[in-house]
Interface confidence: low
């Protein structure tokens, strides 16, 4: 049976996947679906990894973790009762039949008291530029095979993780307020 | 095998108007961010203009904000750039290179062999 | 704009050197640094990203580092065909910038 995974309402869901790639930067794509998952990839889609980088996500999925060091979790933003159900996470390691595969559960509660209005970054309409959030290592060289640690206490907000300014004076016009969870 | 094909360069008069393309094969441009990198002779490189074809986000280099217009049509997997009231310090090699869409990771890793545009009277 | 401040500008070296360039931010960039090797009348080839990422079919005699806003190349064994103008570029914001270039020559 599936591993079950609870939000409420409004907050962010988060669903862990994880492998080890054979070297840090070697990457295996991965891919994230709403269903169970099939035999070969991943139906309906939500986001996809290649052997390099995130290609391809839709609005509000989007990965939090480090995943050149092979976290791929999922974080769900906003959430609403028809996230419930079950993702599939491949992680596509190269052969016949070699896929790794797991299915999660997801139950999303409604919400004890109303949510405060949250910003929901739509990658592929509203900004579809920005980081994923990411927690920064240490500024101190960087080796080939040799990433800092991420410390996931502190894993920076989005609003330090805008990558345009442009975006971010955009919003401190606005009047708009970033809440991360 | 990822290619990337620029056409459109050429000679044009100051205050002229030229649109380049950029056909892209072996990949969907709506999964990458495609830019336009220019460099005028012996000079170095200029990023101008890229586009997020998912969203159609855009973004430009002041230089030509206002005068240049990039786009892409996603079902010929195709990039423009409109270059309007060209300048001769418009005048370089014309590249557009494929980026990817989480801009921390936004390096160019692939390259069309370039377009020259040469803006003179 | 963020400037990226490559240096030398030129280098003269012979085969089985060790060549290091290095590039300066002039503000956080994060991890977000590219390198590129441009040969004349080519586009530029990508050989690292992510500061110190190896591209695939790169040869590992090319490495990257960064120590805060300073960003490192270097070429471990100098090969005839590593003879060159090298770039770097930051991503971290808008617009991404690219230092002004260095041109490796044959001593």
């Known amino acids: 049976s599936e591993v079950e995974y609870r939000a409420e309402v409004g907050q962010n869901a988060y669903l862990p996947c994880f492998y080890t790639p054979a070297a840090p930067g070697n990457l295996v794509p991965v891919c994230w679906g709403k269903g169970a998952c099939p035999v070969f990839e991943c139906g309906n889609v939500v986001l996809r990894t290649d052997e390099r980088d995130v290609n391809y996500w839709t609005s509000r999925y989007w990965l939090n973790g480090d995943f050149r060091k092979g976290d791929v979790s999922l974080t769900i933003e906003n959430v609403i009762l028809a996230d419930s159900g079950i993702y599939c996470c491949r992680i596509q390691i190269p052969g016949i039949m070699n896929d790794e595969k797991f299915n999660l559960k997801l139950v999303i509660k409604p919400a004890k008291v109303t949510p405060a209005p949250t910003l929901q970054r739509d990658f592929t309409a509203a900004f579809p530029r920005m980081l994923t959030t990411r927690g920064h290592g240490p500024a101190e060289t960087q080796t080939l095979g040799s990433l800092p640690d991420i410390n996931l206490t502190q894993i920076s907000t989005l609003a330090n993780e805008l990558r345009d300014s442009r975006l971010a004076n955009d919003l401190r016009d606005s009047g708009a307020t970033i809440r991360i969870g | 095998e990822v290619q990337l094909v620029e056409s459109g360069g050429g000679l044009v008069q100051p205050g002229g108007s030229l649109r380049l393309s950029c056909a892209a094969s072996?990949?969907?441009?709506?999964?990458?961010?495609i830019h336009w990198v220019r460099q005028a002779p012996g000079k170095g490189l200029e990023w101008v203009a890229d586009?997020?074809?998912?969203?159609?986000?855009?973004e430009y280099a002041d230089s030509v904000k206002g005068r240049f217009t990039i786009s892409a049509d996603t079902s010929k997997n195709t990039a423009y750039l409109q270059m309007n009231s060209l300048r001769a310090e418009d005048t370089a090699v014309y590249y557009c290179?494929?980026?990817?869409?989480?801009?921390?990771?936004?390096?160019?890793?692939?390259w069309g062999q370039g377009t020259l545009v040469t803006v003179s009277s | 704009d963020i400037q990226m401040t490559q240096s030398p500008s030129s280098l003269s070296a012979s085969v089985g050197d060790r060549v290091t360039i290095t590039c300066r931010a002039s503000?956080?960039?994060?991890?977000?640094v590219a390198w590129y090797q441009q040969k004349p009348g080519k586009a530029p080839k990508l050989l690292i990203y992510?500061?110190?990422f190896l591209y695939s079919g790169v040869p590992s005699r090319f490495s990257g580092s960064r120590s805060g806003t300073d960003f490192t190349l270097t070429i471990s064994s100098l090969q005839p065909e590593d003879f060159a103008t090298y770039y770097c570029?930051?991503?971290?914001?808008?617009?991404?910038?690219f230092g002004q270039g260095t041109k490796v020559e044959i001593k």
């Open positions: 290179a494929r980026g990817y869409i989480y801009r921390m990771w936004d390096s160019y890793d692939y």
């Open positions: 072996g990949f969907n441009i709506r999964s990458y961010a």
């Open positions: 586009i997020t074809p998912a969203g159609g986000d855009t």
């Open positions: 503000q956080d960039v994060n991890t977000a």
């Open positions: 992510s500061a110190s």
């Open positions: 570029q930051q991503h971290y914001t808008t617009p991404p910038t």
